[in-house]
């Protein structure tokens, strides 16, 4: 994929950021060993990766969380990779679910999501979780990215 | 990414190898259904994938392990994807953590790591785990690879 | 990887389909937000992705399942990514294993598999699981795909 100016590489990898917001959408930052190939992909409002060019993208997210069955709702921890396209409904691209651990005070688990999707110009992808307070933000544990095929 | 001689495909996929070494760095081999596209990526000392060309790479690892909560330390099983670049800090690129199972004698779990990173010429990537004796080496369970975008 | 007619992009992403068949091979469909780049990759019999061109492919699968330790066999839930090449034995490319949850009625878990492999013209890849009745088919939970490097 080493490409000329007509067809530059487009890739991003961003790092999780703890947030005081109560939203279920995870927050990300360009820090540490992040990747942002050029301005054809951008991190907007710390929450979504937005692409300027139409095409096929491999999109991935990894979420590590720490939860306990007794202290959590009965529903599992779910991470969702979602898509927002101009003039379209938001949609779920990928989801993963892990039942809470019985370990005390909490048990760590990691989820990995990844798939190939067609994105339109201006499309944004973001990651939703059932309980953002359970997400682990230690070095390397939670990240989000994409690459254009 | 079908490329000319100027820009050949660069990809590798190597297979886990049980090791008597006490090191936390996993060992790999070019065996079974492995991939080694050319000499622009090499497996060095059975422990690290080293690249000759600078660029963006999607790097991944999968580790399956079998552990038991009572027989293991309280800390979770952690797999780390790490980077060594000449004259730079070694660094953690990605990590995943899974709390040990209560299943007897041990409970199997699988971890998947993957992300896009810029590598310099001569950079090496390797995989660290908290307890290599718990890693499963059956066909297909534990592997490590990369592809150049 | 934006390519000319000589070297078109080849990618697929298909969505799990519940099946009344007793086979351990998962069933897939071109539905929802699926990807099928062109006829150089096809979904055959709803169960395997078949490629027309030789080359290196990144192949992945994600399986979410819900199981309970008491109601399941003692063996873990295993997902396998397998390869069928013309005139060759079938082979396991990747496997992941997760011990069943103690949660009632069942505990959800997600498995992700992915790796780079050389495929021959006419090669097919498919996904096997130990118990297809435990697989979750809700939006985004279980999917399968590939992309040609």
């Amino acid at each position: 994929m080493q490409k000329g100016d007509q067809n530059p590489q487009i890739a991003a990898h961003v790092i999780s950021e703890a947030s005081s917001k109560t939203t279920s959408v995870l927050q990300w930052a360009e820090k540490g060993y992040y990747t942002m190939s050029n301005n054809l992909v951008t991190l907007e409002n710390g929450k979504q990766l937005t692409v300027k060019r139409q095409g096929l993208y491999y999109i991935y997210a990894q979420v590590t969380f720490c939860s306990n069955r007794e202290a959590s709702s009965q529903a599992p921890f779910i991470a969702s990779l979602c898509l927002k396209s101009p003039g379209r409904f938001e949609r779920i691209l990928l989801r993963a679910a892990n039942t809470h651990s019985s370990a005390k005070p909490c048990g760590q688990q990691s989820i990995h999501l990844g798939g190939v999707f067609e994105l339109q110009p201006g499309a944004s992808v973001f990651v939703n979780v059932t309980d953002p307070s359970q997400v682990s933000h230690g070095t390397g544990f939670t990240s989000f990215g994409l690459l254009k095929l | 990414m079908q490329k000319g001689d100027q820009n050949p495909q660069i990809a590798a996929h190597v297979i886990s190898e049980a090791s008597s070494k006490t090191t936390s760095v996993l060992q790999w081999a070019e065996k079974g259904y492995y991939t080694m596209s050319n000499n622009l990526v090499t497996l060095e000392n059975g422990k690290q994938l080293t690249v000759k060309r600078q660029g963006l790479y999607y790097i991944y690892a999968q580790v399956t392990f079998c552990s038991n909560r009572e027989a293991s330390s309280q800390a979770p099983f952690i797999a780390s994807l790490c980077l060594k670049s000449p004259g730079r800090f070694e660094r953690i690129l990605l990590r995943a953590a899974n709390t040990h199972s209560s299943a007897k004698p041990c409970g199997q779990q699988s971890i998947h790591l993957g992300g896009v990173f810029e590598l310099q010429p001569g950079a090496s990537v390797f995989v660290n785990v908290t307890d290599p004796s718990q890693v499963s080496h059956g066909t297909g369970f534990t592997s490590f690879g990369l592809l150049k975008l | 990887m934006q390519k000319g007619d000589q070297n078109p992009q080849i990618a697929a992403h298909v969505i799990s389909e519940a099946s009344s068949k007793t086979t351990s091979v998962l069933q897939w469909a071109e539905k929802g937000y699926y990807t099928m780049s062109n006829n150089l990759v096809t979904l055959e019999n709803g169960k395997q992705l078949t490629v027309k061109r030789q080359g290196l492919y990144y192949i992945y699968a994600q399986v979410t399942f819900c199981s309970n330790r008491e109601a399941s066999s003692q063996a873990p839930f295993i997902a396998s990514l397998c390869l069928k090449s013309p005139g060759r034995f079938e082979r396991i490319l990747l496997r992941a294993a997760n011990t069943h949850s103690s949660a009632k009625p069942c505990g959800q878990q997600s498995i992700h598999l992915g790796g780079v492999f050389e495929l021959q013209p006419g090669a097919s890849v498919f996904v096997n699981v130990t118990d297809p009745s435990q697989v979750s088919h809700g939006t985004g939970f279980t999917s399968f795909g590939l992309l040609k490097l």
Epitope: H13, K31, G32, H137, G138, T139 | L56, Q120 | -
Partner: nanobody
């Protein structure tokens, strides 16, 4: 820019211990992503020894020092430490402290901030 000052080097017998310190001043500590140590023996290239991530205290070590050296940090004092035990003659080198800025990214080789170095000599 962060100013880094190392101390604690000196002459020690094989099997002995030393504790190196690296005090940071200048740019606020929150702008440091990682801090660590390299060493350079006469006629050899500078080699990585250990690193600590400020975010969560995660550490990595070179194979040559694993189990013998321990890196730690005291955020309140803006200081990183390298505890060196079971020292060997081959550990003789100038030890340099380095700091990596917060938003360094993978697509650019960020400039580290460096200390001036402290000499460690292991000899009987």
């Amino acid at each position: 820019e962060v100013q880094l000052v190392e101390s604690g080097g000196g002459l020690v017998q094989p099997g002995g211990s030393l504790r190196l310190s690296c005090a940071a001043s200048g740019r606020t500590f929150s702008s440091i992503y990682a801090m660590g140590w390299f060493r350079q023996a006469p006629g050899k290239e500078r080699e990585f020894i250990a690193v600590i991530y400020w975010r969560d205290g995660s550490t990595l070590y070179a194979d040559s020092v694993k189990g013998r050296f321990t890196i730690s940090a005291d955020n309140s004092k803006n200081t990183a430490y390298l505890q060196m035990n079971s020292l060997k003659p081959e550990d003789t080198a100038v030890y340099y402290c380095a700091a990596e800025p917060y938003g360094s990214g993978s697509s650019l080789i960020s400039e580290y901030d460096w200390g001036q170095g402290t000499l460690v000599t292991v000899s009987s």
